[in-house]
Amino acid sequence: SIPWNLERIIPAWHQTEEDRSPDGSSQVEVYLLDTSIQGAHREIEGRVTITDFNSVPEEDGTRFHRQASKCDSHGTHLAGVVSGRDAGVAKGTSLHSLRVLNCQGKGTVSGTLIGLEFIRKSQLIQPSGPLVVLLPLAGGYSRILNAACRHLARTGVVLVAAAGNFRDDACLYSPASAPEVITVGATNAQDQPVTLGTLGTNFGRCVDLFAPGKDIIGASSDCSTCFMSQSGTSQAAAHVAGIVARMLSREPTLTLAELRQRLIHFSTKDVINMAWFPEDQQVLTPNLVATLPPSTHETGGQLLCRTVWSAHSGPTRTATATARCAPEEELLSCSSFSRSGRRRGDWIEAIGGQQVCKALNAFGGEGVYAVARCCLVPRANCSIHNTPAARAGLETHVHCHQKDHVLTGCSFHWEVEDLSVRRQPALRSRRQPGQCVGHQAASVYASCCHAPGLECKIKEHGISGPSEQVTVACEAGWTLTGCNVLPGASLTLGAYSVDNLCVARVHDTARADRTSGEATVAAAICCRSRPSAKASWVQHHHHHH
Amino acid sequence: QDEDGDYEELMLALPSQEDGLADEAAHVATATFRRCSKEAWRLPGTYIVVLMEETQRLQIEQTAHRLQTRAARRGYVIKVLHIFYDLFPGFLVKMSSDLLGLALKLPHVEYIEEDSFVFAQ
């Protein structure tokens, strides 16, 4: 007897299970930055501390009438979604409310910053258990709001934010665009993106995942026993904040990077109809609906990876795009993608002590994306091996020459602008296992890692006939770490990873010109982490149609 | 995101107005002014002055005080509404936009962001 949204995010085996904190561990605390709330509501009574924090702008209009039930509506509902007894995700969680939104649901960047600072001060004065901060609000892109979120996240606080209800790119809004924040879009009971009047959920590369956000039943501030449904990315974010609270109550030492990776890994995949999003955003938007993951005790030892897209480089001739992993993650591979196919490849370089994935636009190109594969590899030692471009049409190759290091990804970067002279590079494992091979005028980069029990293999899939894309998936138990396109006769747009699927994209116009003998190949590097085993290279599998 | 998307960044390296302060005249503004790309969401007159990451507590207060002093010399009253110590060094100030050029030239200033609205989602 549970509402659709809870049924969707809490798998059957979790529904009766209580997430109790281990003995002696501190309780998870959720901080809600929103409107005022009705703390006496039956759903949340005894679970909520209404702090004395209040930093809101004046309401608009001279005749505005402050009605408590209206002032409390948004915050009360969200508090109920997080920790409500009947309709909450994390029923036992204690919640602290900070008022940063006025009775009209309006706040300021400065008020939100002061609220975040209040949380930091509370943390310094009285260190407690894990903290989750729910930010069910959005404004225009703000460098300082994003920076404040970054600073707070680096103290171990987990921030969850609404993607925004503007049917727009979430990267244009804050705190949704802050990389350190878990940004949540909204889906409905049919797992489709939420429409809200003429607008709807935000989307794009700054969204980490989606969660229920349409017709969500929760506490209503009309009375202490009233319930109502509300819709929006706030409700979606509240679901994820509740999931995170439950994860942390079971395992208080989980880090932000682990939480995000587990949320992504255990989410329901490929149920969202991507056609709802603008065409240029479809590839950037995650097709993921949140579910409560099992504990690491039940699923330990898995290699977890996610795909991080850069911002678009822009069309200038030397425009570059940069994709970064979180500090705790390893950058296991870097690829690039351009809608026009005019790109000069990708590479990994160190900036400020951190490896980043870079992609370069080509003359006449409309711009590129850098696509990083970011993974959690315990006790990893990773390095990049680079071979500069060879002269006179010779191929360039590079392999992992350090003992016990395995190849996790290849990158290729062309020195020349002329797309006609180059044959795009290849990852030719048939010649030598664990080797990246490029053709003339290409610099080749191999990502090599050593970690206990890490083993990898290459899996290829080629299609000779006309096709806009070629895909290859890693089988169950293996995780995709690298994805490249090995071209046939046609111009390739690039390659990227979608969950465990390597997607190689081919230029539409080239399809008619194809000769059947020249297959375009998607090449995936699939890795797994076997506990208490040596790192090893497994001979690849390839298969062509 | 790393790049500042749909976001206004304005370089206000305005010529120093003489007020007899050598250090002010010598300090060229490398700091930037930022504001929300959506005009209706802007709150002109309230600014978040963000200082360099390593700025010490005392320097934050000194910078805010220095801005007040220099503004007063020009006949402007400014109000420091909040000082940020714990998450980032900076302060929130209510002042005329006429003073932005002056504020950007203060030592330790990394950028100034005009306050803007956020909304329940």
Epitope: K91, S220, F227 | -
Partner: antibody
Framework: EVKLVESEGGLVQPGSSMKLSCTAS????????MAWVRQVPEKGLEWVAN????????SYLDSLKSRFIISRDNAKNILYLQMSSLKSEDTATYYC??????????WGQGTSVTVSS | DIVMTQSHKFMSTSFGDRVSITCKAS??????LAWYQQKPGHSPKLLIF???YRYTGVPDRFTGSGSGTDFTFTISSVQAEDLAVYYC?????????FGGGTKLEIK
């Protein structure tokens, strides 16, 4: 499966006392408000009392406040209704119910209490 | 106490018909209203809570609407198994109070 089982009622003299109990199973008892509702044969439903999660807060029908006490034992998953100074108008079928979304979503099978000399 | 009034003690209908039962509160109860079905010899069964939310497992021919003081419970196409007594109940403020009930019968 959620189950609420009321204890046997019975015939009692006017002025006497009786304690009803309701044993809950199939859900986390301490997570729910619980209530008693009664129904006079061939008549409508009348709410009697409810109790919050930990027993620290109770509400009653005004006319019954002085004679009826609702309580709970979360360790044993049992809800009680202590009735004293019983009157003939207390004759009814007594239902124990679980409250969810402030409505009563699960009901026991009911137990018949007859107050008569 | 809030008084709940179901103006019709009985309502006659035919199978397949649409039928609506009304309930009026003596004061504003927002949307804090539930509807129950009781068949002879059985305990009441929750159908609708918070005026318009169908409880889990309840067929979608049952709907509720209204807020404030006036509420309606509708069965879009009456089935044989729907013949029962229907009660409204406010959960806005204690003591919770029920309407007198409306018995649905076949013409």
């Amino acid at each position: 499966e959620v189950k609420l089982v009321e204890s046997e009622g019975g015939l009692v003299q006017p002025g006497s006392s009786m304690k009803l109990s309701c044993t809950a199973s199939g859900f986390t008892f301490s997570d729910y408000y619980m209530a008693w509702v009664r129904q006079v044969p061939e008549k409508g439903l009348e709410w009697v009392a409810n109790i919050n999660y930990d027993g620290s807060n109770t509400s009653y029908l005004d006319s019954l406040k002085s004679r009826f006490i609702i309580s709970r034992d979360n360790a044993k998953n049992i809800l009680y209704l202590q009735m004293s100074s019983l009157k003939s108008e207390d004759t009814a079928t007594y239902y124990c119910a679980r409250e969810k979304f402030a409505a009563m979503d699960y009901w026991g099978q009911g137990t018949s209490v007859t107050v008569s000399s | 106490d809030i008084v709940m009034t179901q103006s019709h003690k009985f309502m006659s209908t035919s199978f397949g018909d649409r039928v609506s039962i009304t309930c009026k509160a003596s004061q504003d109860v927002s949307n804090a209203l539930a509807w129950y079905q009781q068949k002879p010899g059985h305990s009441p069964k929750l159908l609708i809570f918070s005026a318009s939310y169908r409880y889990t497992g309840v067929p979608d021919r049952f709907t509720g609407s209204g807020s404030g003081t006036d509420f309606t419970f509708t069965i879009s196409s009456v089935q044989a198994e729907d013949l029962a007594v229907y009660y409204c109940q406010q959960h806005y403020s204690t003591p919770w109070t029920f309407g007198g009930g409306t018995k649905l019968e076949i013409k």
